[in-house]
Interface confidence: low
């Protein structure tokens, strides 16, 4: 199998004329050291080819998980899930864009996009590196998390005197602690504006507004629909 034929991610599938959004199975790749992986592909948004790495929409899955679970991934690929840091790291080894889509409880949808996205390896604590921000989600609420390591309730890698993962009830690139908390607690309408450990994006709705829906998705920087 040549590199042109290989299927690495949803953009590879798109180029092979798989144009319907949904669940796909990426084959294992011995050269990349990646196992077979079930992914959800967004083949519609802004040209398609996006591999969804996170989704929050139902609140049925707890995101207050440990390091091993965030490494391997958890949840339901059709519902709420985290793809897994090891998988996301492998997917971002080529130059990659990140898109974050969010919806509030009033039904307004906003997005943030980053021209460059890298998740380093486990030895480097899945440190986050981001390029330039664009979008309409207010102030860039991931910039504060750029160049920070991933933390979970059992692995405190943040830049804070506090244990951010335990305080914000998630796994994330905590600094001290958050300008966003996309893996925080899912609060339903009525509770959505009362907590600081919710699914927050400070640049849009501030520190204690937990969003209704969030999706994080990636695709290669050089992707052409």
């Amino acid at each position: 199998q040549t590199s042109a034929d290989a299927i690495y991610d949803c953009s590879s599938l798109y180029q092979k004329n798989y144009r319907i959004s949904g669940v796909y199975r990426l084959p294992s790749n011995d050269f990349l050291g990646s196992p077979e992986l079930e992914v959800f592909c967004d083949m519609e948004t802004k040209g398609g080819g996006w591999t969804v790495i996170q989704r929050r929409k139902s609140g049925l899955v707890s995101f207050y998980r440990d390091w091993k679970q965030y490494k391997q991934g958890f949840g339901s690929i059709r519902g709420d899930f985290w793809l897994g840091n090891e998988h996301i790291h492998r997917l971002s080894r080529q130059p990659t864009r990140l898109r974050v889509e969010m919806e509030d409880w009033e039904g307004t949808v906003r997005y943030a996009e980053y021209s460059h996205f890298v998740l380093s390896n486990e030895l480097n604590s899945y440190r986050l590196f981001l390029g330039n921000y664009s979008g309409n989600a207010g102030n860039d609420a991931l910039y504060y998390h750029n160049n920070t390591a991933f933390s979970t309730k059992d692995k405190d890698n943040d830049n804070c005197l506090d244990k951010c993962a335990q305080l914000r009830k998630g796994g994330y690139w905590y600094n001290c602690c958050t300008d966003s908390n996309l893996n925080g607690v899912y609060y339903r309408l009525g509770e959505h504006d009362k907590h600081l450990d919710g699914i927050t994006w400070y640049g849009w709705h501030g520190a204690n507004y937990s969003l209704k829906r969030v999706e994080m998705k990636i695709r290669p920087e050089d992707f052409k629909p």
Epitope: D158, R168, Y174
Partner: antibody
Framework: EVQLVESGGGLVQPGRSLRLSCAAS????????MHWVRQGPGKGLEWVSG????????GYADSVKGRFTISRDNAKNSLYLQMNSLRAEDTALYYC?????????????WGQGTLVTVSS | DIQMTQSPSSLSASVGDRVTITCRAS??????LNWYQQKPGTAPKLLIY???SLQSGVPSRFSGSGSGTDFTLTISSLQPEDFAAYYC?????????FGGGTKVEIK
């Protein structure tokens, strides 16, 4: 009820040492970061140092770095500030302050302070 | 280090007045800005955290706004017990820094 009680202040000569203590009660001490903040006579507030819940993270103001050492004993619910090589400009009321439970560098409870006077 | 500049350094006002104090950061600090009140001979008291969140037990006449570099503390209707010094503080990064303070005095 959260209570923070500082002690150990007093008159000390320049170049000498002093150790401040803060006894905490009314909350689970080892869940929270703690800080020292000082206020010179007739002056504003100045953050001195902070320490994480498990002493894993520690920070200092540039003005005290290398001279002051913050520590805590979670078993005794106590916070300490070892102050060496004291200078006249260290004269201040020293407050012990608790961080909030959402992981941020600010102070939701304060003690009443202990006065340190550095003078020959 | 991030410098915090508070203005005015002092002001005179009457009971019932609307009072506004501003704080400017030397670089963007998102919403990591907090406000404290200090009365003579007592420890500071937290009023507002995260730019606009009211600390539990603080009267609703106190409010905060702003993000980035410019922030405001507003007292909608000054009460006798509000005559005090007010400090802003950035909690974006260490070293933590305070504004120089604003003394609110009786006119």
């Amino acid at each position: 009820e959260v209570q923070l009680v500082e002690s150990g202040g007093g008159l000390v000569q320049p170049g000498r040492s002093l150790r401040l203590s803060c006894a905490a009660s009314g909350f689970t001490f080892d869940d929270f970061a703690m800080h020292w903040v000082r206020q010179g006579p007739g002056k504003g507030l100045e953050w001195v140092s902070g320490i994480g819940w498990n002493s894993g993270s520690i920070g200092y103001a540039d003005s005290v770095k290398g001279r002051f050492t913050i520590s805590r004993d979670n078993a005794k619910n106590s916070l300490y500030l070892q102050m060496n090589s004291l200078r006249a400009e260290d004269t201040a009321l020293y407050y012990c302050a608790k961080a909030p439970d959402y992981g941020d560098y600010y102070f939701d409870y304060w003690g009443q302070g202990t006065l340190v006077t550095v003078s020959s | 280090d991030i410098q915090m500049t508070q203005s005015p350094s002092s002001l005179s006002a009457s009971v019932g007045d609307r009072v506004t104090i501003t704080c400017r950061a030397s670089q963007s600090i998102s919403i990591y800005l907090n406000w404290y009140q200090q009365k003579p001979g007592t420890a500071p008291k937290l009023l507002i955290y995260a730019a606009s969140s009211l600390q539990s037990g603080v009267p609703s006449r106190f409010s905060g706004s702003g993000s980035g570099t410019d922030f405001t503390l507003t007292i909608s209707s000054l009460q006798p017990e509000d005559f005090a010094a007010y400090y802003c503080q950035q909690s974006y990064t260490t070293p933590l820094t305070f504004g120089g303070g604003t003394k609110v005095e009786i006119k």
